[in-house]
């Protein structure tokens, strides 16, 4: 095709007609449409969506949608033989079970296929023993039970509370502490708001709502079956027994009406102190075991779920660049939900359809973008970010190559307050940019821009008049592309003012109550949030491909390496006297961020006065921005995670939700006074020192003059 | 090893507040539970409360009615205990223990509430 | 609040011998119960902790036994150094709450 089609654009063409076509009510009809029946993943009815979605991306003009389909390991309950909780007497009987199905939701009693609550993943069991409650199950929890209180969980089942972080770490800790298998439970504390009702007359989790969730520990590896490689035709497998990930001790998930009855009941110690207590009226004792009377009852778990390898289906839109097709902006979200995905993730699948739409509008009439713009419906991603890390895999040469950013559309919504993004640094200027020029959809801010509503609800810890713009972590499909391919990447949704919760989810997270209803009639009736998550999303992907330069300031990249440093070593710094034993010095890493931040101010000083119609010297100057986040890749990855290979950004080891900055130092750094071997644990904080310096310095060079 | 170190001894008026400090050393700060109790002459001891240090997360014991506050100072390892409205039955050596099960204990601080 | 009654008031054992102490819950406190040692003008001490681990450093004449509202604490052959008085203390239901303790002498 001619490049001569990016002359194409009149001023009708341009980002203001690009939003303009975007509409709410079209939002609120993909919604309804794709919330009606459950889609979950491997089934029928998620392989119809992505057909219809393949069919309607086509009718909305995209150049080519085709579906990508993988061979992956999922897990499902067994129908004819349900998984559940006992609490069983000293002769065996069983005196009370959990339930077996939350109630349905009003309007879909009749629905079939509804998956019953599960832990996917967990392995077979029926373990029976004492129970301990260990709070939200985090590594300091943990350390407070076995280190402070002298609990020995070895050979316990214990129950934690949902919430905090990621549900695959806290069984990790379970296991590491030696359960023989994990409840998690939803606690009012966390998952009911004070004075809102719950479902079906408010936002609220009622007490037979439970969350369903997958329990890897995947660190990025996709199938487990299958790690580094897609799951194809041709795949060589893994046995079970060396699959990625896969917990080891039996896990199941319940509501807290549930919970009341086995935590009531309770004995042992008391709670170390008010942040375990939850709102339940029970005394929330850690244990071990029953108190009194029910001192000879156990716990008894009946979990016969099961992993099989199954089909699953991305759908991969293309709308190809008319100047630099060979340059890839990508919107990837997922399709497949639990129950009926009202939020999670349908209100952001909704979105990415109206965002297709007004593309293919755009393309109708001629327009196309600079760049290529690849658009995805990922598979599999309650299961592991499945679908996007096998794309990510079987066209990974492609990416490393051509990737220039992705951008994240799961939800939409997570609450009705302000915005929330996640993004690399390169993208502030661009987010900063593109809020500035949107109108806010807030009461209270009629008028006014979206980002002085976000910057006031939602202040920058650092930079006053700035808003906060959280670190990547992972949990979502844009992990295999920052933390394993090091694409820019970011991500936008409307929140809620609850900062203290932030990696807790709404109430009715991945459970049967996710439906249509809820957003329509009590997060969003309107839809003006979710036309505001399209503006950001989409504008920015407009950006991306569309601007002649590349909307990437290597500046605020500098800025933030600095303030990581200064993190890591004030954390060492809490070690003096082993820095001085062992010669820790972090002058290697200062001196790298200051040469990065000197090279990258004269980089952006060359940016203003290139010569920007020389095609050659534009393409140089945009390669170097692109390749920029390519360049804090260790293609050696990081210690036991050769799947997280960002130096700068990696998944908490502790909570895969959350970003850690300096990930390598930070872990070697972590319970460092514990190590039984001192100058071996500071040799490896030395080596990851020296890991960072290096790689800090070489991302630098990267942005000097080429010659 | 683990060392607590408290503050020395106070005369304070009734009505008036107390505000007593613990220094620890010797073991991770934020492990351990603190806890602070108090042992009236020649009687038996009292506990009056605790925090995590790791969250700030406290428990007190409902007798003392509000008028105790236990805090930390995570950045000098140091926890703190104030008890307000003062009155002549808190004459006392106040403690400060460390570890869920009072595993380490400061030397005490011996705090006389007269007119 | 859970009352923690320790018996006898004070003890008087011949050295070598053995002094069993006892404290008694008012209700089922599961084994969540520490022994103390508070020797005269010094802090109180930890020996026992979940009613039968022995703490750190504390030499196995100490013992301790007992589940849901009796508990002992034995030492089963006194040295000079012993003596002292003994608290319980009860952690499964706040507020925490301690004996009265046990005043142990030389005979």
């Known amino acids: 095709k001619s490049s001569n089609e990016a002359t194409n654009i009149t001023p009708k063409h341009n980002m203001k007609a690009f939003l303009d076509e975007l509409k709410a009510e079209n939002i609120k009809k993909f919604l309804y449409n794709f919330t009606q029946i459950p889609h979950l993943a491997g089934t029928e009815q998620n392989f119809q969506l992505a057909k219809q979605i393949q069919s309607q991306w086509k009718e909305f003009g995209l150049d080519s949608v085709e579906l990508a389909h993988y061979d992956v390991l999922l897990s499902y309950p067994n129908k004819t033989h349900p998984n559940y909780i006992s609490i069983i007497n000293e002769d065996g009987n069983e005196i009370f079970n959990t339930s077996l199905f939350e109630p349905p939701p009003p309007g879909y009693e009749n629905v079939s296929d509804i998956v019953p609550p599960f832990s996917a993943f967990s392995p077979q069991g029926m373990p029976e023993g004492d129970l301990v409650y260990v709070n939200y199950a985090r590594t300091e929890d943990f350390f407070k039970l076995e280190r402070d209180m002298k609990i020995n969980c070895s050979g316990k089942i214990v129950i934690a509370r949902y919430g905090k972080v990621f549900r695959g770490n806290k069984v990790k800790n379970a296991q590491l502490a030696g359960a023989k298998g994990v409840i998690l439970y939803s606690d009012p504390a966390d998952y009911f708001a004070p004075g809102v009702k719950s479902y079906p007359d408010g936002w609220n989790l009622p007490g037979g709502g439970v969350q369903r969730g997958n329990i890897l520990n995947l660190n990025g590896a996709g199938d487990p079956l299958t790690p580094g490689y897609p799951a194809n035709e041709y795949a060589y497998r893994r046995g079970i027994a060396e699959a990625v990930g896969l917990p080891s001790i039996p896990v199941h998930p319940i509501g807290y009406y549930d919970a009341q009855k086995l935590l009531e009941k309770m004995g042992g110690s008391a709670p170390p102190d008010s942040s375990w207590r939850g709102s339940l009226k029970v005394p929330y004792n850690v244990g071990p075991g029953f108190t009194g009377n029910f001192s000879t009852q156990k716990v008894k778990m009946h979990i016969h779920s099961t992993n099989e390898v199954t089909r699953i289906y991305n759908v991969i839109g293309t709308l190809r660049g008319a100047v630099e097709p060979d340059r890839y902006v990508i919107l990837g979200g997922h399709r497949d939900s639990w129950v009926f995905g009202g939020i999670d993730p349908q209100s952001g699948a909704a979105v990415v359809h109206e965002i297709v739409r007004s593309f293919g509008t755009l393309k109708k009439e001629g327009w196309r973008p600079r760049r290529t713009i690849l658009f995805a419906s990922w598979d599999a991603e309650e299961f592991g970010l499945l679908g996007s890390t096998e794309w990510a895999e079987e066209n990974s040469r492609l990416l490393q190559e051509r990737g220039v950013a992705y951008i994240n559309a799961d939800s939409s919504i997570e609450g009705n307050y302000t915005l929330r993004v996640d993004c690399t640094p390169l993208m502030y200027s661009l987010v900063h940019n593109l809020t500035k020029e949107l109108k806010s959809p807030d009461e209270g801010f009629e008028g006014k821009s979206l980002y002085e509503s976000w910057t006031k609800k939602s202040p920058s810890p650092e930079f006053s008049g700035m808003p906060r713009i959280s670190k990547l972590g992972s949990g979502n499909d844009f992990e295999v592309f920052f933390q394993r391919l090091g694409i820019a990447s970011g991500r936008a949704r409307y929140t809620k003012n609850w900062e203290t919760n932030k990696f807790s989810g709404y109430p009715l997270y991945h459970s049967v109550y996710e439906t249509y209803e809820l957003v329509e009639k009590f997060y969003d009736p309107m839809f003006k949030y979710h036309l505001t998550v399209a503006q950001v999303r989409g504008g920015m992907v407009f950006e991306l491909a569309n601007s002649i330069v590349l909307p990437f300031d290597c500046r605020d990249y500098a800025v933030v390496l600095r303030k990581y440093a200064d993190k890591i070593y004030s954390i060492s710094m809490k070690h003096p006297q082993e820095m001085k034993t062992y010669s820790v010095s972090f002058d290697s890493l200062f001196s790298a961020v200051k040469n990065f931040t000197e090279i990258a101010s004269k980089f952006s000083e060359r940016l203003q006065d290139f010569d920007k119609s020389n095609p050659i010297v534009l393409r140089m100057m945009n390669d170097q921005l692109m390749f920029l986040e390519r360049a804090f890749i260790d293609p050696l990855g990081l210690p036991d995670r050769p799947f997280y290979r960002h130096v700068i950004y990696a998944p908490s080891s502790h909570n895969k939700y959350a970003g850690e900055s300096f990930p390598g130092i930070y872990d070697a750094l972590f319970d460092i006074e514990s190590k039984v071997d001192p100058s071996k644990a500071w040799g490896e904080v030395k080596r990851q020192i020296y890991v960072a310096a290096f790689t800090v310095q070489a991302a630098a060079e990267t942005l000097s003059e080429v010659a | 090893e683990v060392q607590l170190v408290q503050s020395g001894a106070e005369v304070k008026k009734p009505g008036a507040s107390v505000k007593v400090s613990c220094k620890t050393s010797?073991?991770?700060?934020?492990?351990?539970?603190i806890h602070w109790v108090r042992q009236a002459p020649g009687q038996s001891l009292e506990w009056m409360g605790n925090i995590n240090p790791n969250n700030g997360g406290t428990t007190y014991n409902q007798k003392f009615q509000g008028r105790v506050t236990i805090t930390v100072d995570k950045s000098t390892s140091t926890a703190y205990m104030e008890l307000s409205s003062l009155r002549s039955e808190d004459t006392a050596v106040y403690y400060c223990a460390a570890g869920w099960n009072f595993d380490y204990w400061g030397q005490g601080t011996l705090v006389t509430v007269s007119s | 609040d859970i009352v923690m009654t320790q018996s006898p008031d004070s003890l008087a054992v011949s050295l070598g011998e053995r002094a069993t102490l006892s404290c008694r819950a008012s209700q089922d406190v599961g084994t969540a119960v520490d022994w103390y040692q508070q020797k005269p003008d010094q802090s109180p001490k930890l020996l026992i902790y979940?009613?039968?681990t022995r703490h750190t450093g504390v030499p196995d004449r100490f013992t301790g036994s007992g589940s849901g509202t009796d508990f002992t604490l034995t030492i089963s052959s006194l040295q000079a150094e012993d003596v002292a008085v003994y608290f319980c203390q009860q952690y499964n239901s706040y507020p925490k709450t301690f004996g009265a303790g046990t005043k142990v002498e030389i005979k």
């Open positions: 010797g073991y991770t700060f934020t492990e351990y539970t």
């Open positions: 979940w009613a039968s």
